[in-house]
């Protein structure tokens, strides 16, 4: 047992926030400034992520954990760990190569990010359109025409665009 212990890698004793310094007889040295080690037994420290440009610092780097970034106002995070910042658009728009574009007829976006989505197809549930959709808002589905009391009526949606074909409401 003693023999096994003596053969054990001495670096395994180095805690997070340090590295096993080969140049100093495998002594555990603290990570240099702007670097970190999040686990024990590491032979090097990783360089801290720098939140520059459109990125801003959400959490500072420490000797044991990397910095975390988010995006400056007008942008939002994309990808694991906020690897990209993407421009915000207004409601009723989506981002394309050319920047923010209004949602096509038959679609809406009620957020500042993401893509335009089709209006709900009320007829799938046997309902009718109670309130028409807009670029910013989905349609509101109401009771089916048969369920409406005499004299009541639902809103007739505008005729769908021919190209591309949007499903009937």
């Amino acid at each position: 047992f003693e023999r096994t212990r003596s053969l054990q890698d001495p670096c395994s004793n180095c805690p997070a926030g340090t590295f096993c310094d080969n140049n100093r007889n495998q002594i555990c040295s603290p990570c240099p400034p702007n670097s970190f080690s999040s686990a024990g037994g590491q032979r090097t420290c990783d360089i801290c992520r720098q939140c520059k440009g459109v990125f801003r610092t959400r959490k500072e780097c420490s000797s044991t954990s990397n910095a975390e970034c988010d995006c400056t106002p007008g942008f939002h995070c994309l990808g694991a760990g906020c690897s990209m910042c993407e421009q915000d658009c207004k409601q009723g728009q989506e981002l394309t190569k050319k920047g923010c574009k209004d949602c096509c007829f038959g679609t809406f976006n009620d957020q500042k990010r993401g893509i335009c989505r089709p209006w709900t197809n009320c007829s799938l549930d046997g309902k009718s359109v109670l309130v028409n959709g807009t670029k910013e808002r989905d349609v509101v589905c109401g009771p089916s025409p048969a369920d409406l009391s005499p004299g009541a009526s639902s809103v007739t949606p505008p005729a769908p665009a021919r190209e591309p074909g949007h499903s009937p409401q």
């Epitope: 190569k97 089709p118 197809n121 190209e163």
Partner: antibody, heavy 121, light 111 residues
Framework: EVQLVESGGGLVQPGGSLRLSCAAS????????IYWVRQAPGKGLEWIGN????????FYGEKFMGRATFSADTSKNTAYLQMNSLRAEDTAVYYC??????????????WGQGTLVTVSS | NVMLTQPHSVSESPGKTVTISCKLN????????VHWYQQRPGSSPTTMIY?????PDGVPDRFSGSIDSSSNSASLTISGLKTEDEADYYC??????????FGGGTKLTVL
């Protein structure tokens, strides 16, 4: 791991109909467009239309309006393509594909393996 | 109708460089992103280039994409050709953000 698995292809008589399935896994099914694309033997890719499974909203290519119908069952994470009045020229491999939600003109990041539909008597 | 036109076929020797063009017949090639898919026989398309010039993880840097606004076209360039690059290549863009448009495809033969 994101996967799209298609089924339902096979031999169909002219004038008949088909119902293809596209079973999705590994992501939030209701938050991405599913596009349907077909490829006739030796030919290129052709857009049929697309569905937003989150609310059943659909768009159809002009050529397929009235003949194709898309639907989705969110409890099964599966999208469906129903096509009627089939003709010989509808013989093709039918693919479903997912579009990311980053931008309105994005690529298709995952494709199904395709299912062959042969229309013949 | 918006159309993307590709050469029907191109061929080149291993180790050489080949460029496949994708010309937009109307509108501006800069209005929407262009994407490129590779399709080997009997397989589904896979993305080689997305958003004009970006490579997905796992795609070799031998593949590159570009846009030329003066010719209103996009290009896929493959350098250091290998026999495994032999496949059909399709460009893809949009007529509107709902309506995708595909090129007719280019068959690449590695001699």
């Amino acid at each position: 791991e994101v996967q799209l698995v298609e089924s339902g292809g096979g031999l169909v008589q002219p004038g008949g109909s088909l119902r293809l399935s596209c079973a999705a896994s590994g992501y939030t099914f209701t938050s991405y467009y599913i596009y349907w694309v077909r490829q006739a033997p030796g030919k290129g890719l052709e857009w049929i239309g697309n569905i937003w499974p989150g609310n059943g909203g659909t768009f159809y290519g002009e050529k397929f309006m009235g003949r194709a119908t898309f639907s989705a069952d969110t409890s099964k994470n599966t999208a469906y393509l129903q096509m009627n009045s089939l003709r010989a020229e509808d013989t093709a491999v039918y693919y479903c594909a997912r579009r990311p939600d980053y931008s309105g003109d994005d690529y298709f990041d995952y494709w199904g393996q395709g299912t062959l539909v042969t229309v013949s008597s | 109708n918006v159309m993307l036109t590709q050469p029907h076929s191109v061929s080149e020797s291993p180790g050489k460089t080949v460029t496949i063009s994708c010309k937009l017949n109307s509108g501006n090639i800069g209005s929407y992103y262009v994407h490129w898919y590779q399709q080997r026989p009997g397989s589904s398309p896979t993305t080689m280039i997305y958003r004009d010039d970006k490579r997905p993880d796992g795609v070799p840097d031998r593949f590159s994409g570009s846009i030329d606004s003066s010719s209103n076209s996009a290009s896929l360039t493959i350098s250091g050709l290998k026999t495994e690059d032999e496949a059909d290549y399709y460009c893809h863009s949009y007529d509107s953000t709902i309506t995708p448009v595909f090129g007719g495809g280019t068959k690449l033969t590695v001699l």
